[in-house]
Interface confidence: low
């Protein structure tokens, strides 16, 4: 025998209190599939979360993060603070990358500069807190008079970048 509830479409629920009539989901709830006996409560995007997509009778609300924060976790379950390029987020807030490391994004961790010598190459452009080293040709490839490479600027000391 076919379950009468299976005829209830998404956006409705099978109301046992009303002889299994398909009733629309109440406000602030949804059912994304047919044949549901209850509707799910819509997610509320509060605090640092903001609404990216409003809840409808057939789909849940979707949240993202307010400016200055970015999403973490499945379905943006958490918001984490942005930092500036050249910084990483620590327990006590945004901190400049240590000398020898960089971060070219507003999120994530500082990563070590590329070690050009491991590939037998020379440093073409020094690294900064925001940018990785640029490796150039190997020193042997730079025959006298053939190079137009400008000498690299001195590497920036940690903690002295303008905020």
């Amino acid at each position: 025998l076919q379950d009468p509830c299976s005829n209830c479409p998404a956006g409705t629920f099978c109301d046992n209190n009303r002889n299994q009539i398909c009733s629309p989901c109440p406000p602030n709830s949804f059912s994304s599939a047919g044949g549901q006996r209850t509707c799910d409560i819509c997610r509320q995007c509060k605090g640092v979360f903001r609404t990216r997509k409003e809840c409808s009778s057939t789909s849940n609300a979707e949240c993202d993060c307010t400016p200055g924060f970015h999403c973490l976790g499945a379905g943006c379950s958490m918001c984490e603070q942005d930092c500036k390029q050249g910084q990483e987020l620590t327990k006590k807030g945004c901190k400049d990358c240590c000398f020898g490391t960089f971060n070219d994004q507003k999120r994530g961790i500082c990563r070590p500069w590329t070690n050009c010598s491991l590939d037998g190459k020379s440093v073409l452009v020094n690294g900064t807190k925001e940018r990785d080293v640029v490796c150039g040709p190997s020193p042997a490839d730079l025959s006298p008079g053939a190079s137009s490479v400008t000498p690299p600027a001195p590497a920036r000391e940690p903690g002295h970048s303008p905020q």
């Epitope: 509060k46 605090g47 640092v48 976790g73 958490m78 984490e80 603070q81 327990k91």
Partner: nanobody
Framework: EVQLVESGGGLVQPGGSLRLSCAAS????????MGWVRQAPGKGREFVSA????????YYADSVKGRFTISRDNSKNTLYLQMNSLRAEDTAVYYC?????????????????????WGQGTQVTVSS
């Protein structure tokens, strides 16, 4: 001295309810995200729920969604976990944790390493 003192645990039958409390002192409570973590016998720690410093953001593990409610009263420096429809698998020691909320005003984390301070725990046993 920082202190987190949990209370409200005990023995309850399946389907029953308990309300855990965590009284905090020694730090600026409203600046800290708070969390509940549990550890069942012979198992690792499981993050149950977390709430931001201003109470605006909350997180629940899938295993407790719709049954547990986390809340906080910043005027009383107290964190709460209302646990309804308890199941045998909810049996564990429940720990309260506090982490400085650099994510303020809406930040929280489910990484245990985020949390600076931990309570001693309160035992919850669900059994008939």
């Amino acid at each position: 001295e920082v202190q987190l003192v949990e209370s409200g645990g005990g023995l309850v039958q399946p389907g029953g309810s308990l309300r855990l409390s965590c009284a905090a002192s020694g730090f600026t409570f409203s600046s800290y995200a708070m969390g509940w973590v549990r550890q069942a016998p012979g198992k690792g720690r499981e993050f149950v729920s977390a709430i931001s410093g201003n109470g605006g953001s909350t997180y629940y593990a899938d295993s407790v969604k719709g049954r547990f409610t986390i809340s906080r009263d910043n005027s009383k420096n107290t964190l709460y976990l209302q646990m309804n429809s308890l199941r045998a698998e909810d049996t564990a020691v429940y720990y309260c944790a506090a982490g400085y909320s650099y994510l303020y005003p809406g930040g929280l984390s489910t990484r245990p390493s985020f949390y600076d301070y931990w309570g001693q725990g309160t035992q919850v046993t669900v059994s008939s």
